[in-house]
Interface confidence: low
């Protein structure tokens, strides 16, 4: 394979156009670049993008800090998928988005002591091991170095989910929650993106083991309520994105928790707020709080007579409870 350039960070070397099939038992030479990849030693970057790779290249150069494996056909990430001798000690950012992963096994990211950012977005993750981020030894929950975990649009198609649609969604949410709360592994996580996953609710303990979280993105899901979520322990949380969900109202417990977070900014645009008597506490809170960004843009969706009314402009006389909700907006 050709040498990686060191003169320009934007210059990449491509390896020979064939897919190596043998597993190399030796550490790669410093200038080696895997087949079907582009490498820049100066930028400490390897890009194996849109090459239909079916497994992670074995001969990744030891200098790699940024690894892009997007747009491939990896299907499964086994334990130790990135384990090398010596370890890829510099690898800090790993992007696996859009690589048709449907299974991530326990210990898939072991032996990556510097891994700070991981992007698994746009993969139909039907099987995400509870130990995917915490190591393959079930008896051990050593801390992960991960700081940013990007899991946008990882929900598998409906026909790949267990037990049909509603039960399948509950199972999916539970599977994701189990991976996030595994031991104490993700206690250093500061950014978590879970947008566009059709979440109907937040499992009660989804966030329980993520005390360092600063940024949480839950936009474009199907969240109807935050009743079971607890943000109380997320004392470092700075940004909570809840745009484009199905939220009808935020209840007192949630309002108090959010108000109690010292650095929080909450984003609530494009939710179908139901402006009836249950909305009174939230409207009062909105008028007083500084934590909601763009609160003047929040408008009612139901009942019909209140549609497009600005929440901040409502008073208690506007908020009555005579309408019957359409079935699609009723919750148990």
């Amino acid at each position: 394979s050709s040498s990686s350039p060191t003169s320009s960070a934007s210059s990449f070397s491509s390896s020979a156009p064939f897919l190596a099939s043998a597993v190399s038992a030796q550490p790669p030479l410093p200038d080696q670049c895997p087949a079907l990849c582009e490498c820049s030693e100066a930028a400490r970057t390897v890009k194996c993008v849109n090459r239909n790779l079916t497994e992670v290249p074995t001969d990744l150069p030891a200098y790699v800090r940024n690894l892009f494996l997007t747009g491939n056909q990896l299907a499964v990430l086994p334990a130790g998928a990135f384990a090398r001798r010596p370890p890829l000690a510099e690898l800090a950012a790993l992007n696996l988005s859009g690589s048709r992963l449907d299974e991530v096994r326990a210990g898939a990211f072991e032996h990556l002591p510097s891994l700070r950012q991981l992007d698994l977005s746009h993969n139909p993750l039907a099987d995400l091991s509870p130990f995917a981020f915490s190591g393959s030894n079930a008896s051990v929950s050593a801390p992960s170095p991960l700081e940013e975990l990007i899991l946008n649009h990882i929900v598998p198609p409906e026909d790949q989910r267990q037990n049909g649609s509603f039960e399948g969604m509950v199972a999916f949410e539970g599977m994701v929650a189990a991976a996030l709360r595994s031991g104490l592994a993700l206690r250093g996580l500061t950014r978590l993106e879970l947008a566009s996953n059709h979440f109907l609710f937040l499992p009660r303990d989804l966030l329980a083991q993520l005390p360092s979280l600063r940024y949480l993105d839950l936009r474009n899901n199907s969240l109807v309520s935050l009743t079971y979520a607890s943000f109380r322990n997320l004392t470092h949380l700075e940004s909570l994105h809840l745009e484009d969900n199905a939220l009808k109202v935020l209840h007192n417990g949630t309002l108090a928790e959010l108000q109690g977070l010292p650095h929080i900014r909450v984003f609530l645009d494009n939710n179908p707020w139901v402006c009836d008597c249950h909305m009174a506490d939230m409207v009062t809170w909105l008028k007083e709080t500084e934590v909601v960004q763009g609160k003047d843009r929040l408008t009612c969706a139901y009942p019909e007579k209140m549609r497009n009314r600005v929440l901040l402009e409502l008073n208690s006389a506007d908020l009555d409870c005579d309408p019957i909700l359409p079935p699609s907006l009723q919750t148990s």
Epitope: V23, R85, R105, G135, N137, A138
Partner: antibody
Amino acid sequence: QVQLQQSRPELVKPGASVKMSCKASGYTFTDYVISWVKQRTGQGLEWIGEIYPGSNSIYYNEKFKGRATLTADKSSSTAYMQLSSLTSEDSAVYFCAMGGNYGFDYWGQGTTLTVSS
Amino acid sequence: QIVLTQSPAIMSASLGERVTLTCTASSSVNSNYLHWYQQKPGSSPKLWIYSTSNLASGVPARFSGSGSGTSYSLTISSMEAEDAATYYCHQYHRSPLTFGAGTKLELK
């Protein structure tokens, strides 16, 4: 519970080859690394190599490369080590062990290899 | 390769005595990847301490581990008869993976 069951003791002649096995049970075979470790009588431990059955990635100690061959059969959840060109120096107990960078959690009971004419 | 030197090679300790075994690496080892095993005659090694200071399942609390860089140690706060065994340190940091030669701990 996790178990690693190793094959019976072997008595072989110098220059011959031997293939020993390590059958795993109680966990998902493809999720964990299997390492092989040598221990001569009254001596310390020496790492031979390791295999990830999930991706079939294999790493060898250079000292054993070329004489040790590690394989895994996913269908039977069994790892194998073949040693060739045997000498009396190869007489030892050989352990398989399961685990990762946080230590080898589980060990087989060992296979005793005796190389003698 | 990283050479792990254990000292002493053999040590005798009385019941109740505080015992410290040391492991020195020829070059720096990531503390996450430094482990200790206990082995008794005729048995397989057992993971005893992982990632420098974490006790494996079932290991008595009188054991502890510490260290960083090239210097690591295993300590028993109060020696008991069942602690007599050989202890090996092990690095899972660089290939080839290596073990120390072991410290044989005997009951005085």
